[in-house]
Amino acid sequence: VEVQVSEDPVVALVDTDATLRCSFSPEPGFSLAQLNLIWQLTDTKQLVHSFTEGRDQGSAYSNRTALFPDLLVQGNASLRLQRVRVTDEGSYTCFVSIQDFDSAAVSLQVAAPYSKPSMTLEPNKDLRPGNMVTITCSSYQGYPEAEVFWKDGQGVPLTGNVTTSQMANERGLFDVHSVLRVVLGANGTYSCLVRNPVLQQDAHGSVTITGQPLTF
């Protein structure tokens, strides 16, 4: 028996359902009573779901997994993972045994989009050209860790005096805070771009300082 899975990682958004595809080619006369199917975490061997001797043995993994029972006899051994969490990320091995056996691993990449950044300025009044200001760009609830880019009004990258911190919350999602320290010119626009590297999703925020008042 030959087991086939997708070579590319499966990308799943947090709180959505994901299908880890796995298939095999049943011989003529194949019956589910002959099938041993095991899904397990590749790195720890932890059992995720199994089907043996014609019976779905159920989820051994937080009761969020399911097979496609009507499709098993056709060789579809795919696994449905419900309400995906950050902690589900990793490699899953699909092991199929009939007369002989084979296995293959599929990777699950979890992702969550970042919120539109909020911009804050310190100090935020009595600003004059030549003043040093701190601009903070904050974006929330994304995964995996973001890439953050700063640019000025002419699109020139600002790389000096940037400090970015990313903190995971209890769900494993990241809140990003990036701080730019800059000396004000007469007028200036400062843009922050927060990129999710898996989703290739960009979230933009900017602040324009025109003497007074400030615009965000």
Partner: antibody
Framework: EVQLLESGGDLVQPGGSLRLSCAAS????????MNWVRQAPGKGLEWVAG????????YYADSVKGRFTISRDNSKNTLYLQMNSLRAEDTAVYYC???????????WGQGTTVTVSS | QSVLTQPPSASGTPGQTITISCSGS????????VNWYQQLPGTAPKLLIY???QRPSGVPDRFSGSKSGTSASLAISGLQSEDEADYYC???????????FGGGTKLTVL
């Protein structure tokens, strides 16, 4: 030829320590999980510990938890078992065995003898 | 006390068929595939049957394995004197996160 060769077995006093080694050859050691299994004189096989291919995941039998440490050096194709606080009941032949993707221990070493006695 | 239960001994005459049972639970045999090992006196264990019923190359087809529910069994047909050995079943236990072995069955060929 696929081969596992254990070494380091010795006579040691209760409370003492010992480190066993298992040299692997003939297969891609760094892609395999590995195990230690022991057999006390006249008794059956008892699994001791297992480790994943990269060395970051380890499992232990309750009887050795907190006393034994399994580790590996993939650059040397070698598996280790550090045994501390040894007891008389740890006296056994210790085998290393591979643990392939299909959850089979199909290659075993010849064993090394550990005797814990005063 | 082993997690998997095997009869401590079995015997048969040359040419006979004998069966060795291995009883487990839903967290090991019920969910996982079973392997069987043969250990001749004074030697290391040798893989005899893997994935419930598969024979490694070089193992005679007199040896066969099967699994049903939480039990597995090893059958040896056409018993020969060189089959005299200890036989162990083994599998992974998902509750214990441990490999578990049967206590072993000593086969005597009369």
């Amino acid at each position: 030829e696929v081969q596992l060769l254990e070494s380091g077995g010795d006579l040691v006093q209760p409370g003492g320590s010992l480190r066993l080694s298992c040299a692997a050859s003939g297969f891609t050691f760094n892609t395999y999980w590995m195990n230690w299994v022991r057999q006390a004189p006249g008794k059956g096989l008892e699994w001791v510990a297992g480790i994943n291919s990269k060395g970051g995941v380890t499992y232990y039998a309750d009887s050795v938890k907190g006393r034994f440490t399994i580790s590996r050096d993939n650059s040397k194709n070698t598996l280790y078992l550090q045994m501390n606080s040894l007891r008389a009941e740890d006296t056994a032949v210790y085998y290393c065995a591979d643990w392939n993707d299909y959850d089979i221990m199909d290659v075993w070493g010849q064993g090394t003898t550990v005797t814990v006695s005063s | 006390q082993s997690v998997l239960t095997q009869p401590p001994s079995a015997s048969g005459t040359p040419g006979q068929t004998i069966t060795i049972s291995c009883s487990g639970s839903s967290s090991n045999v019920g969910r996982r595939t079973v392997n069987w090992y043969q250990q001749l006196p004074g030697t290391a264990p040798k893989l005899l049957i893997y994935t419930n019923a598969q024979r490694p190359s070089g193992v005679p087809d007199r040896f066969s394995g099967s699994k049903s529910g939480t039990s597995a069994s090893l059958a040896i047909s056409g018993l020969q004197s060189e089959d005299e050995a200890d036989y162990y079943c083994a599998t992974w236990d998902d509750s214990l996160n441990a490999w578990v072995f049967g206590g072993g069955t000593k086969l005597t060929v009369l």
